[in-house]
Amino acid sequence: YDFTNCDFEKIKAAYLSTISKDLITYMSGTKSTEFNNTVSCSNRPHCLTEIQSLTFNPTAGCASLAKEMFAMKTKAALAIWCPGYSETQINATQAMKKRRKRKVTTNKCLEQVSQLQGLWRRFNRPLLKQQ
């Protein structure tokens, strides 16, 4: 999906008001310095591409993020404010159905959510030069 035509300001507002709080809740008890940010993005469409991938695609050691509250709200924001987004997902999500039960938080998942927080922060500051 090409995120170029999304309403970035509305997605940003939803993130700041709600999604960010759910990410913090997920990370509660974890020091903010515990994980290094290794995933980056260069502009808002790219950031949303990376956010979608990290949120909804199972990775080794962390298959369950897509069933978390912040993921549901992320999906809602993308579907509402990115034209045509909801039509692009059929096969991808259905294929993962069986593997996506909510379960105990692993260290790998905490690391992945820490990366997500970094991507969202970058999404919110699109005019900053890439480091």
């Epitope: 700041l16 008001s17 709600t18 809740t25 809602a76 579907a79 509402i80 987004y85 909801s86 259905q94």
Partner: antibody, heavy 121, light 108 residues
């Protein structure tokens, strides 16, 4: 304008199933989660689960896992809630409600009018 | 599961009186995830307050909401007859989504 119109009242026997429909209009059906909530007579509100019509993704309250099935038909913009192995305690009004961002806060905005399901032998 | 406990369950109030309904949450949640609904007999619930303190469209300004962590409040500054209803708090912080048991306001 956004509307959620639910199917009519049902009377069912214990052990049977019921399927309640919720027809959406006035918005892009596939882009919004649909929640299902029930209310037993004189009681409070109880969340059953939600479905995202875009890809059929679902979440259920543990209590209803395995007994409730949420589906959505994008071609008719209709969400369905099927409840099996009915018992008298399932007698309730069943509501569908659209999940959305309201002033950047996520919650439900539009609700269906409710469908009364009576389970009686 | 997060449990929401409202107080009182029932209140009989005279018009123009100030009313306070509390919602106690079993574990701390973000204020952005606490909402209030109003329901009148034989009607669907209506969104009333989003994110602890933001009034839904059409809700009179005599209503307000506040709170954080585990303690939330809905306040009606000067009760009017049309406010007779049951009010529910709800959390959107974690699954399953849960509601308070409701507070029924009756006009004396």
């Amino acid at each position: 304008q956004v509307q959620l119109v639910q199917s009519g009242a049902e009377v069912k026997k214990p052990g049977s199933s019921v399927k309640v429909s919720c027809k959406a209009s006035g918005y892009t059906f596939s882009s919004y989660w649909v929640n299902w909530v029930r209310q037993a007579p004189g009681q409070g509100l109880e969340w059953i689960g939600q479905i995202y019509p875009g890809d059929g993704d679902t979440d259920y309250a543990q209590k209803f896992q395995g007994r409730a099935t949420l589906t959505a038909d994008k071609s008719t913009s209709t969400a369905y809630m099927e409840l099996s192995s009915l018992r008298s305690e399932d007698t309730a009004v069943y509501f569908c409600a659209r999940g959305t961002y309201y002033n950047n806060y996520y919650g439900t905005d539009y609700w269906g009018q409710g469908t009364t399901v009576t389970v009686s032998s | 599961e997060i449990v929401l406990t409202q107080s009182p369950d029932f209140q009989s109030v005279t018009p123009k009186e100030k009313v306070t309904i509390t919602c106690s949450v079993s574990s701390s949640i973000s204020s952005s995830n606490l909402h209030w609904y109003q329901q009148k007999p034989d009607q669907s619930p209506k969104p009333w307050i989003y994110g602890t303190s933001n009034l839904a469209s059409g809700v009179p300004s005599r209503f307000s909401g506040s709170g954080s962590g585990t303690d939330y409040t809905l306040t009606i500054n000067s009760l009017e007859a049309e406010d007779a209803a049951t009010y529910y708090c709800q959390q959107w912080s974690s699954y399953p989504l849960t509601f308070g048991q409701g507070t029924k306001l009756e006009i004396k």
